[in-house]
């Protein structure tokens, strides 16, 4: 809960001008949903819808919240102190490896292969093969038979987007 | 329930120090910040500071800076806040309130009188 | 330090009547702005946060709105038990400061 965020944890893009050393470090940080002032005396609020800060801090300025792109459903907007929640659409997914977009569901598996698990925001339905029950893993083929089956419906928030 | 049970009525002489206590019970001691709020005989609300229990880290109105020390007891789930040099204008009742993210205040404290008479 | 400016001052109301009491600004606030309804004895206790946000349990007749400089506190239909003194307070910067307070009595 004590966590804390500093200029130095930021990307470069988000660093903002150096800050004077203040000499009490307990004295020097502004609680989630502030930042601190330029002289490094006062916390001042983010911008509700606007802005966060999710940690104790001496960033000069906030952080701005995502807005959730088209293709996402916003699941909890952003407050001064947590960035919005976005999730991939029914249908949809968003896998570890291209966080930056949802990607459509596959709507059956290939022949040969029984859908084990139905698709959710985070993956795509999964497909083991009949006989060995070993997952299929890689792109169905371009021509396939397939088993169709009603995209799942979302049940918890993926990782956030932005 | 979350509850904010403050320690009882002082009468100090001008020059002394008083200290206060606020107990937290009903939620989680170290995830919230405490401030500390006056508020003199018949007048209005000033806020003096706050500690976060969680990290130690605390703030202090300027005015109240070099005379106000703020301090935290995990193991007991108090906050402190002691005054020093009283004068008679400190006279007041203290109020412990908690800092809900992003609201202020969304629990306070019954009060403290503290009345500085010679 | 952000100044706040409560009127009126004090104001008496029937029960049923529709009150407002409005707090100023010094300096922008960007909407961080609380009210509490003080009753003799009692410590304050929160109304409204971020102008206009309903605190959980408290009676749908109040309801607070603006935004700037510019923030009101409105009770819809005025009930006996509602006699307190009324305190804005901004929680944009520290250090964070209280209107001086409007007392509300029923006549």
């Known amino acids: 809960e004590s966590a804390l965020i500093t200029q130095q944890d930021l990307a470069p893009q988000q660093r903002a001008a150096p800050q004077q050393k203040r000499s009490s470090p307990s004295e020097g940080l502004c609680p989630p949903g502030h930042h601190i002032s330029e002289d490094g005396r006062d916390c001042i609020s983010c911008k509700y819808g606007q802005d966060y800060s999710t940690h104790w801090n001496d960033l000069l300025f906030c952080l701005r919240c995502t807005r959730c792109d088209s293709g996402e459903v916003e699941l909890s907007p952003c407050t001064t102190t947590r960035n919005t929640v976005c999730q991939c659409e029914e249908g949809t997914f968003r896998e570890e490896d291209s966080p930056e977009m949802c990607r459509k569901c596959r709507t059956g598996c290939p022949r040969g292969m029984v859908k084990v698990g139905d698709c959710t925001p985070w993956s795509d339905i999964e497909c083991v093969h009949k006989e060995s029950g070993t997952k299929h893993s890689g792109e169905v083929p371009a021509v396939e038979e397939t088993v169709t089956s009603s995209p799942g419906t979302p049940a918890s928030p993926c990782s956030l987007s932005g | 329930e979350v509850q904010l049970v403050q320690s009882g009525a002082e009468v100090k002489k001008p020059g002394a120090s008083v200290k206060v206590s606020c107990k937290a019970s009903g939620y989680t001691f170290t995830s919230y910040t405490m401030h500390w709020v006056r508020q003199a005989p018949g007048q209005g609300l000033e806020w003096m500071g706050w500690i976060y229990p969680g990290g130690g880290y605390t703030k202090y109105a300027q005015k109240f800076k070099g005379r106000v020390t703020m301090t935290g007891d995990t193991s007991t789930s108090t906050v402190y806040m002691e005054l020093s040099s009283l004068r008679s204008e400190d006279t007041a009742v203290y109020y412990c309130?908690?800092?809900?993210?992003?609201?202020?205040?969304?629990?306070w404290g019954q009060g403290t009188l503290v009345t500085v008479s010679s | 330090d952000i100044q706040l400016t409560q009127s009126p001052s004090s104001l008496s109301a029937s029960v049923g009547d529709r009150v407002t009491i409005t707090c100023r600004a010094s300096?922008?606030?960007?909407?961080?702005l609380a009210w509490y309804q003080q009753k003799p004895g009692q410590p304050p206790k929160l109304l409204i946060y971020w102008a206009s946000t309903r605190e959980s349990g408290v009676p749908d007749r109040f309801s607070g709105s603006g935004s700037g400089t510019d923030f009101t506190l409105t009770i819809s239909s005025l009930q006996a038990e509602d006699v307190a003194v009324y305190y804005c307070q901004q929680h944009y910067i520290t250090p964070f400061t209280f209107g001086q307070g409007t007392k509300l009595e029923i006549k």
């Open positions: 300096q922008d606030v960007s909407g961080a």
């Open positions: 309130a908690r800092h809900e993210e992003g609201i202020y205040f969304d629990k």
